[in-house]
Interface confidence: low
């Protein structure tokens, strides 16, 4: 069964290569365990960037991923991806799975286009 997942269509990464965006879903029932996966779509291929499981007690996720972090609050996840470079510009999709208790629900957002601009190198200065 499907749930509606919403995320912003466009986000500009900071000059430090950090992009943050919310991923929200329409809760269908009280859920003890929510799995959130960030996927990057390039052409017809989906690549998993990071994934985590949130619970009522574990509201900070992606501890196994150095480039992802996120916090969970009811039906909203605030996602942050860091270490981004210009080559990482692309469409990032948020997938939400209501894992437990049943019934199982899944939903995928339409994706957030993250634009990353590499900072210009600082010119050497002779002082």
């Amino acid at each position: 069964e499907a749930i509606q997942v919403t995320q912003p269509s466009v986000v500009l990464a900071s000059s430090h290569g950090v992009a943050s965006f919310p991923c929200e879903y329409s809760p269908s029932h009280n859920t003890d365990e929510v799995r959130v996966t960030v996927l990057r779509q390039t052409n017809d291929q989906m690549t998993e960037v990071c994934a985590t499981t949130f619970t009522e007690k574990n509201t900070v996720g992606f501890l196994d991923y150095p480039f992802c972090s996120g916090t969970f609050n009811e039906s909203r996840v605030n996602l942050t991806i860091q270490g981004l470079r210009a080559v990482d510009t692309g469409l990032y999709l948020c997938k939400v799975e209501l894992m437990y208790p049943p019934p199982y629900f899944v939903g995928m957002g339409n994706g957030t286009q993250i634009y990353v601009i590499d900072p210009e190198p600082c010119p050497d200065s002779d002082f």
Epitope: E1, R35, T37, A51, P102, Y104, F105, V106
Partner: nanobody, 113 residues
């Protein structure tokens, strides 16, 4: 529409093993999580285990943790549930389910001596 067909059930003795299979047709299931559920004789349907899209991640109900193992073969479009150290209370009809499918017919597992 993805169709799921469960198989592999049967009669097992307490302490025995069974391996259930869940074959998908109509679409690939590699991009979705898949769960096993069971319906007990008392008509209570409960969650058993879930395999996430990256098959490295599995989640289990406390009642089966350490005894059951969920796995998937994306090339064969099939999900498995290896059931070891079976107990009489594991007797139920077992179903697999994804977010893309309706409930199938399930496969009956009976644990009895």
């Amino acid at each position: 529409q993805v169709q799921l067909v469960e198989s592999g059930g049967g009669l097992a003795q307490p302490g025995g093993s069974l391996r259930l299979s869940c074959a998908a047709s109509g679409s690939t299931i590699s991009s979705v999580a898949v769960g096993w559920y069971r319906q007990t004789p008392g008509n209570q349907r409960e969650w058993v285990a879930t395999s996430s899209t990256s098959s490295t991640t599995a989640t289990y109900a406390d009642s089966v943790k350490g005894r059951f193992t969920i796995s998937r073969d994306n090339a064969k479009n099939t999900i498995y549930l290896q059931m070891n150290s079976l107990k009489p209370e594991d007797t139920a009809v077992y179903y697999c389910k994804t977010g893309l499918t309706n409930w199938g017919r399930g496969t009956q597992v009976t644990v009895s001596s």
